[in-house]
């Protein structure tokens, strides 16, 4: 008598999540009499997947009619496959008895489930950084299978190279996650820049998923300060201008100090945006020279986005009386800049 063979022809089957999987199994002989059962896994922890005789298996159906005389095909179809269904499936022949006795197992069919990665989520640094500093962005995507996946980073269309990517877990799993970190050097021109994390996977049919982050959320562009004194007016008033340029974000407070005392405080709001996304702001202070007997020390103090204040200071010399005062411009400086401005009563 020929020995019974349980034949599972496919060593492996790959199915997209949500689809149906067909697991093939045939036997070489109708004897001995007894049922076929399907298990996921082997050993004492194996799970019963299908037993024609008894049980309720709503997602599993027999491919051919198992009640048909001389049936030797015990293939099954599992519907609505999820990543949790991955594993090795065994078709097992039992001999009829009380209880039934396990006789022979097929070689097993490894079911792998193709699952799409979730939309990549890109997150940037918790606090803003200034231009010329490097910041890190992370990109995460989950739930994909198989493990092979490609992740690329772009800044304004140019691929980034300072990237570290990990796919977890390291071994075989039901599904996988990817986490990537890109280091980006900020420049003053990056307010309108964008980083893109692009994920390509076999399940996406060449149409990669993208996650984006705007560098405007990560960058702080500190202002340039320029102070100018206009020509002395006929009424002995000196017009001093504090120009604050090329800053981002808009959150800025400007304070004028006369001899160390607060003269006026202004908050920037509703400013027009420059082409590069930064902002400019100009503040004027009129100083009545004739009202002062001694020199006046003027300070333009700018506090940008909660950072330490930047000052520019000027001395208005009351003793001198030059009639036509030229335009005095302070060079860019982040510390304290003192200049002498001569004014008089005429």
């Amino acid at each position: 008598e020929e020995e019974l063979q349980v034949i599972q022809p496919e060593k492996s089957v790959s199915v997209a999540a949500g689809d149906s999987a067909t697991l093939n199994c045939t036997v070489s002989s109708l004897i001995p009499v007894g049922p076929i059962q399907w298990f996921r896994g082997a050993g004492p922890g194996r799970e019963l997947i299908y037993n024609l005789k008894e049980g309720h298996f709503p997602r599993v159906t027999a491919v051919s009619d198992p009640t048909k005389r001389n049936n030797m095909d015990f293939s099954i179809r599992i519907s609505n496959i999820t990543p949790a269904d991955a594993g090795t499936y065994y078709c097992v022949k039992f001999r009829k008895g009380s209880p039934d006795v396990e006789l022979k197992s097929g070689a097993g069919t490894e079911l792998s489930v193709r699952a799409k990665p979730s939309a990549p989520v890109v997150s940037g640094p918790a606090v803003r950084a200034t231009a010329e500093h490097t910041v890190s962005f992370t990109c995460e995507s989950h739930g994909f299978s198989p493990r092979d996946i490609t992740l690329k980073w772009f800044k304004n269309g140019n691929e980034l190279s300072d990237v570290q990517t990990n796919v977890d877990p390291a071994g075989k799993s039901v599904s996988y996650s990817i986490r990537s970190t890109a280091r980006v050097l900020l420049t003053r021109r990056d307010v309108h820049s964008q980083v893109i994390c692009e994920v390509a996977h076999v399940t996406l049919q060449g149409d990669p998923l993208r996650g984006t982050a705007n560098l405007s959320e990560a960058i702080r562009v500190p202002p340039f300060l320029e102070v100018t004194q206009q020509s002395m007016r006929a009424d002995n008033q000196v017009n001093v201008t504090c120009q604050v340029t090329k800053f981002y974000p808009q959150r800025l407070q400007l304070t004028w100090l006369e001899n160390g005392n607060v003269s006026r405080t202004e908050m920037a709001s509703a400013l027009p945006e420059n082409k590069d996304g930064t902002y400019n702001w100009t503040s004027w202070l009129l100083v009545n020279v004739s009202a002062h007997r001694d020199d006046v020390k003027l300070t333009c103090q700018v506090e940008h986005d909660g950072q330490p204040a930047v000052n520019k200071s000027f001395s208005v010399k009351v003793s001198a009386h030059p009639k036509e005062q030229g335009s005095n411009t302070a060079a860019e400086n982040t510390g304290t800049n003192e200049r002498n401005i001569y004014g008089g009563s005429g």
Epitope: A42, G43, P44, E102, S105, S173
Partner: antibody
Framework: QVQLQESGPGLVRPSETLSLTCTVS????????WSWIRQPPGKGLEWMGF???????FYNPSLKSRVTISLDMSMNQFSLKMTSVTAADTAVYYC????????????????WGQGTTVTVSS | DIVMTQSPLSLPVTPGEPASISCKSS???????????LDWYLQRPGQSPQLLIY???NRASGVPDRFSGSGSGTDFTLKISRVEAEDVGVFYC?????????FGGGTKVEIK
């Protein structure tokens, strides 16, 4: 090539809980049983229990009330917790991979960690 | 629980000579599918155990062919055709048919 690495404290006080973790590298958790086996000084091997990739656990009845084995597939790790330890629990603790290819039985414990020595003492 | 009994407890051997270790189980390890779920392990001094034989007679990957397993039901034997110096250590049999998995007490093999 699959490697297993046990980690956890080398000294545990009597009546406290022993906690060990085994990290699986270079291979899959799927389709295997993940076992804890211990060896008291100068003695033989004692199987404590294992967990299958589907989370089903099996324990040695002599320890069952005190032992819990859990699996973290995302971290490629499995863990052992044993409560109310005594000096008799002093041993080298091994984590190991058990194969299952056919039927209800098992087909060899083919990968072992290097073992971690746990001493129970006050 | 299935009780595993090994003999001898200690086995002095001469390199190049054959050696044999016996393992008996308190109940049959032969399952209805025809497989005998018995493993053999070698634990060299200071090392973790290593799988030699599974299902009674199947050599594990990388195990030299001087090791062979035989037996069925309750009586099993591990044979070493020509002992080498690296074979010293403790040999254990283990039943893998049902939980709790149980080990024999071990056979210590040492060079004469």
């Amino acid at each position: 090539q699959v490697q297993l690495q046990e980690s956890g404290p080398g000294l545990v006080r009597p009546s406290e809980t022993l906690s060990l973790t085994c990290t699986v590298s270079g291979g899959s958790i799927r389709n295997y049983y993940w076992s804890w086996i211990r060896q008291p000084p100068g003695k033989g091997l004692e199987w404590m229990g294992f967990i299958y990739d589907n989370g089903r656990t099996f324990y040695n009845p002599s320890l069952k009330s005190r032992v819990t084995i859990s699996l973290d597939m995302s971290m490629n790790q499995f863990s052992l917790k044993m409560t109310s330890v005594t000096a008799a629990d002093t041993a080298v603790y091994y984590c190991a991979r058990v194969r299952a290819y056919s039927g209800i039985g098992l087909d060899g414990t083919d990968v072992w960690g290097q073992g971690t020595t746990v001493t129970v003492s006050s | 629980d299935i009780v595993m009994t090994q003999s001898p407890l200690s086995l002095p051997v001469t390199p190049g000579e054959p050696a044999s270790i016996s393992c008996k189980s308190s109940q049959s390890l032969l399952y209805s599918n025809g497989y005998a779920y018995l493993d053999w392990y070698l634990q060299r001094p200071g090392q973790s155990p290593q799988l030699l034989i599974y299902q009674g007679s199947n050599r594990a990957s990388g195990v030299p062919d001087r090791f062979s397993g035989s037996g069925s039901g309750t009586d099993f034997t591990l044979k070493i055709s020509r002992v080498e110096a690296e074979d010293v250590g403790v040999f254990y049999c283990m039943q893998a048919l049902q939980t709790p998995l149980t080990f024999g007490g071990g056979t210590k093999v040492e060079i004469k």
